[in-house]
Amino acid sequence: MMTGTIETTGNISAEKGGSIILQCHLSSTTAQVTQVNWEQQDQLLAICNADLGWHISPSFKDRVAPGPGLGLTLQSLTVNDTGEYFCIYHTYPDGTYTGRIFLEVLESSVAEHGARFQIP
């Protein structure tokens, strides 16, 4: 039975040209996290494998940095980065947990700076 829950940063906003940390946290389970996939719509951004380490998809390697922790840092944001992001936790023995984050990249300084995990 899957007892865990994923906490995420929820809906966040950031300024064009800035950076943002996407963060998820799996709680309420003793399942072992084997791998976390970060995806944007149907595109794989990065993988954090507990044993094999981080892999950043080649098309994103200039703008995506691993961490902190199992999170992902997006840099040099553009308006096109607006959209849904998913953290997919592959665990044993529970199976797969998925968290959703919606990022809005704003043109000017109207972005909220109070969001958790955000880089000023």
Epitope: Q35, N37, L44, D51, L52, Y92
Partner: antibody
Framework: EVQLVESGGGVVQPGRSLRLSCAAS????????MVWVRQAPGKGLEWVAS????????YYADSVKGRFTVSRDNSKNTLYLQMNSLRAEDTAVYYC????????????????????WGQGTLVTVSS | EIVLTQSPATLSLSPGERATLSCRAS??????LAWYQQKPGQAPRLLIY???KRATGIPARFSGSGSGTDFTLTISSLEPEDFAVYYC?????????FGGGTKVEIK
């Protein structure tokens, strides 16, 4: 730090038996699949056998099927390879290795790569 | 059984040069391919998994590419410690198989 230490190798006559052990430390042994790989002198690598984390499934190379048995004792953090009816062509350095699991989100299946290896133990089958 | 054929058998190069090693599978292994490095008297070391992903601690000069039946390991600029034997391995299905190896030696 993951450590794998093989033992039990030596010189044995054709047709006789030998049991290799692999003592594991530095990780949760019961959570990982384990494998045996061998390398004949001056030759390449040959996969010998695999066993799932809980010992429920075992897989063998055709060259050893029916003669070799892989097993594990999770309470002792130890992997074994029982080798019977040994032949000259079984002469090799035998390595144990721990798999690392990778989830392929395209084909929706796990793959197992041999990330951590012991230093090997030499088995010589000779009369 | 899936047969992996590595070429060339030996590659003679100088430090600083680029090394390109090939591995061809007798049938598709998708991206379920690994590359290992082995030095004399040592156990193999995992370099690349899933055809193109570097394992933890592997320098960026090592890169893998390919899928299906044709795969390549590239060492962008050879360091003295890179002279060794390299093996490809498929983990697509049992029996798991290794290629015959490519020896990268100092010219």
């Amino acid at each position: 730090e993951v450590q794998l230490v093989e033992s039990g190798g030596g010189v044995v006559q054709p047709g006789r038996s030998l049991r290799l052990s692999c003592a594991a430390s530095g990780f949760t042994f019961e959570s990982y699949g384990m494998v045996w790989v061998r390398q004949a002198p001056g030759k390449g690598l040959e996969w010998v056998a695999s066993i799932l984390y809980d010992g429920s499934n075992r897989y063998y190379a055709d060259s050893v099927k029916g003669r070799f048995t892989v097993s594990r004792d999770n309470s002792k953090n130890t992997l074994y390879l029982q080798m019977n009816s040994l032949r000259a062509e079984d002469t090799a350095v035998y390595y144990c290795a721990r798999v690392s699991y990778y989830y392929d989100s395209v084909e929706l299946r796990w793959a197992e790569y041999f990330q951590h290896w012991g230093q090997g133990t030499l088995v010589t089958v000779s009369s | 059984e899936i047969v992996l054929t590595q070429s060339p058998a030996t590659l003679s190069l100088s430090p600083g040069e680029r090394a390109t090693l090939s591995c061809r599978a007798s049938q598709s292994v998708s991206s379920y391919l690994a590359w290992y490095q082995q030095k004399p008297g040592q156990a193999p070391r995992l370099l690349i998994y899933d055809a193109s992903k570097r394992a933890t601690g592997i320098p960026a000069r090592f890169s893998g590419s390919g899928s299906g039946t044709d795969f390549t390991l590239t060492i962008s600029s050879l360091e003295p410690e890179d002279f060794a034997v390299y093996y490809c391995q498929q983990v697509h299905n049992f029996p798991l198989t290794f290629g015959g190896g490519t020896k990268v030696e100092i010219k």
